[in-house]
């Protein structure tokens, strides 16, 4: 019995069937970021909760040291939301002083690291200027897309300013991936 | 014949196979919200179109009384976008009056209700300060992530200010979920 | 052997099984938009990279002439992010001149074209007022949802102002779809 017997008639080659409940999946939630050493010239990576509350990893998808480890090759949907929170915007201060107002910005990057490849690959980026009039502000950046990943690839979430990340609630800042 | 015969060689235990087209799925679209009574101290829940236009429910995923009812346990991807529209920002009025400008905000929460559990669980939250200079403004908040749900769980979308929701078009404000 | 033998006991009718790796999928990334003729009274459509870098199409999902062509009927998750970048906001200029400040806006629409249907269908819209104080600004609009599509349907991404799209990086502006 071959998997392709179930394929639509126009489809000749057919990959083996597998149960959906067995696929690698993870949903990670925010935890407080303690000050750590970050790589120079690289946005700092967030670390995550992987088993408490809404967070989980399953079917060989493991979380370790800020990375999600991809256990098998395939197409994955990867997503993250980071909620940022600031007490003021330097942009408005610059504006008041009458100097040209280059905006502040907040950025989230989902990055893939492949050990055999020297440079990390930026899979997704959400970046937004912040030039708020208010004395305090907050807003989310959401990202999500599908990528072909290889067994052993590692995923992380990098942010432009780790001190602005809202880590007060697990539903505000999160990171996940699942094999399609 | 057991499902695991199709499993990759490194996989011992294997859940039964099932066809993708048979999985519970729903995409709901916005409808006009008439003023109604809401629970005290809780963001009001939106109600939705479930069968006209782009909206649908299928494979035992049912919509009733503002809730999506989860018909079988498993991992679901859940998403929503709410477009908000305001005629002014009180923040700007407060600012003009020279008082400290606590920003207005808009918030979307996707909430899970489990009958056996006393408190609803907030799965996803998108929250954004609104301190617009313009006399009218509009913007979406998008959310999406994967969660492990149980048969009988109910999902709803709550918003901070129901009177700011743009319900003029089905592509602007929507809510969906599908079993992975 | 019938597909439904693997179905949960409460499920009578069951679609044929098929391997996940065989499903139509695409992730397209931004390329520089050269000035072209657009349809009158319709937002211009973006064109995309479909094979270099992070971009791919597979399993009969084809990209041609700004469209993703749907090769088989079913439920698809469709997503896009467009990052916009502006050097100024007319809104702030209007404001300084003391005239009423109707905001500028940025809009992304994911549109379905069905040859047998005269009018395109707007599946998803993200629209945001832009009334920035800063002299330059940038921000993403993200969209994603599930839709029932028919074989032969075509998908495109339309934007309100093609000259504001940030096409500098493949992780900032993208478009994808996959059969569930």
């Amino acid at each position: 019995l071959k998997g392709q017997e179930f394929a639509p008639s126009h489809q000749q080659v057919y990959a083996p069937l597998r149960a959906d409940g067995d696929k690698p999946r993870a949903h990670l939630t925010v935890v407080r970021q303690t000050p750590t050493q970050h790589f120079k010239n690289q946005f700092p990576a967030l670390h995550w909760e992987h088993e408490l509350g809404l967070a989980f990893t399953k079917n060989r998808m493991n979380y370790t040291n800020k990375f999600l480890l991809i256990p098998e090759s395939g197409d994955y949907f990867i997503y993250s939301q980071v909620t940022f929170r600031g007490m003021t915007s330097e942009c408005s201060e610059i504006r008041q002083a009458g100097r040209p107002n280059k905006p502040d910005s907040i950025t989230v990057v989902i990055t893939k690291v492949t050990d055999s490849y020297p440079e990390p690959t930026q899979l997704l980026m959400g970046t937004k200027s912040v030039c708020e009039v208010g004395s305090n502000w907050f807003q989310p950046i959401y990202l999500g897309a599908m990528f072909s990943l290889q067994e052993g690839d590692k995923l992380m979430v990098n942010v432009s300013d780790i001190s602005l990340v809202d880590y007060t609630k697990e539903d505000k800042t999160f990171f996940g991936a699942f094999l399609l | 014949l057991k499902g695991q015969e199709f499993a990759p060689s490194h996989q011992q235990v294997y859940a039964p196979l099932r066809a993708d087209g048979d999985k519970p799925r729903a995409h709901l679209t916005v409808v006009r919200q008439t003023p109604t009574q809401h629970f005290k101290n809780q963001f009001p829940a939106l109600h939705w179109e479930h069968e006209l236009g782009l909206a649908f429910t299928k494979n035992r995923m049912n919509y009733t009384n503002k809730f999506l009812l989860i018909p079988e346990s498993g991992d679901y991807f859940i998403y929503s976008q709410v477009t908000f529209r305001g005629m002014t920002s009180e923040c700007s009025e407060i600012r003009q009056a020279g008082r400290p400008n606590k920003p207005d905000s808009i918030t979307v929460v996707i909430t899970k209700v489990t009958d056996s559990y006393p408190e609803p669980t907030q799965l996803l939250m998108g929250t954004k300060s609104v301190c617009e200079v313009g006399s009218n403004w509009f913007q979406p908040i998008y959310l999406g992530a994967m969660f492990s749900l149980q048969e009988g769980d109910k999902l709803m979308v709550n918003v901070s200010d129901i009177s700011l929701v743009d319900y003029t078009k089905e592509d602007k404000t929507f809510f969906g979920a599908f079993l992975l | 052997l019938k597909g439904q033998e693997f179905a949960p006991s409460h499920q009578q009718v069951y679609a044929p099984l098929r391997a996940d790796g065989d499903k139509p999928r695409a992730h397209l990334t931004v390329v520089r938009q050269t000035p072209t003729q657009h349809f009158k009274n319709q937002f211009p459509a973006l064109h995309w990279e479909h094979e270099l870098g992070l971009a791919f199409t597979k399993n009969r999902m084809n990209y041609t002439n700004k469209f993703l062509l749907i090769p088989e009927s079913g439920d698809y998750f469709i997503y896009s992010q467009v990052t916009f970048r502006g050097m100024t906001s007319e809104c702030s200029e209007i404001r300084q001149a003391g005239r009423p400040n109707k905001p500028d806006s940025i809009t992304v629409v994911i549109t379905k074209v069905t040859d047998s249907y005269p009018e395109p269908t707007q599946l998803l819209m993200g629209t945001k007022s832009v009334c920035e104080v800063g002299s330059n600004w940038f921000q993403p609009i993200y969209l994603g949802a599930m839709f029932s599509l028919q074989e032969g349907d075509k998908l495109m991404v339309n934007v309100s102002d093609i000259s504001l799209v940030d096409y500098t990086k493949e992780d900032k502006t993208f478009f994808g779809a996959f059969l569930l």
Partner: antibody, heavy 118, light 107 residues
Amino acid sequence: QGQLVQSGAEVKKPGASVKVSCQASGYTFTAYYMHWVRQAPGQGLEWMGWINPNSGGTNYAQKFRGRVTMTRDTSISTAYMELSRLRSDDTAVYYCATGGSWEGFDYWGQGTLVTVSS
Amino acid sequence: DIQMTQSPSSLSASVGDRVTITCRASQSISSYLNWYQQKPGKAPKFLIYAASRLQSGVPSRFSGSGSGTDFTLTISSLQPEDFATYYCQQSDSTPITFGQGTRLEIK
């Protein structure tokens, strides 16, 4: 089903002020903006402004700024509209109205006739 | 401010007639247009929102169309209870503004 009940008719002299009340029932008062619309005899509808009952924030039409004040008392689900320095051309029926969003007013008060006459 | 202009100001028609009222905005208001019906001595009644979407409980003989600056309200087959004054209203931006009204009378 929501309902808005307004205070009774008023007769005022030019230069005086009038305060019209609007009591809401059947829906969550604080969740929906309350608008005020007036209609002079034989004339069309004219929007005056709104109040956000939750925050107390207001937005007034330019024509009425400086003369109109909209307030609310959430404990009794009531909105108020006060118009000062009344003139004879302020003679009109004043309506409170609310809706699920900006897109239309579902519920209207029965109207309050304010007559300004010396 | 956005000006709303209705035409005609008044019209006479008979029961069973098809009637169209137009409303023009002084600038684009997308589809943020609503229609009301008002009878003498009564508060307005909400009919149509978002240019074309029927408010719950409104008979299907009422329909709306248009976007941008030009809009129409159509009554496909006039009934005795439809004789009233009709107003369009834009909800695109403040100040919210109404058309001057169209009075529909029995011929």
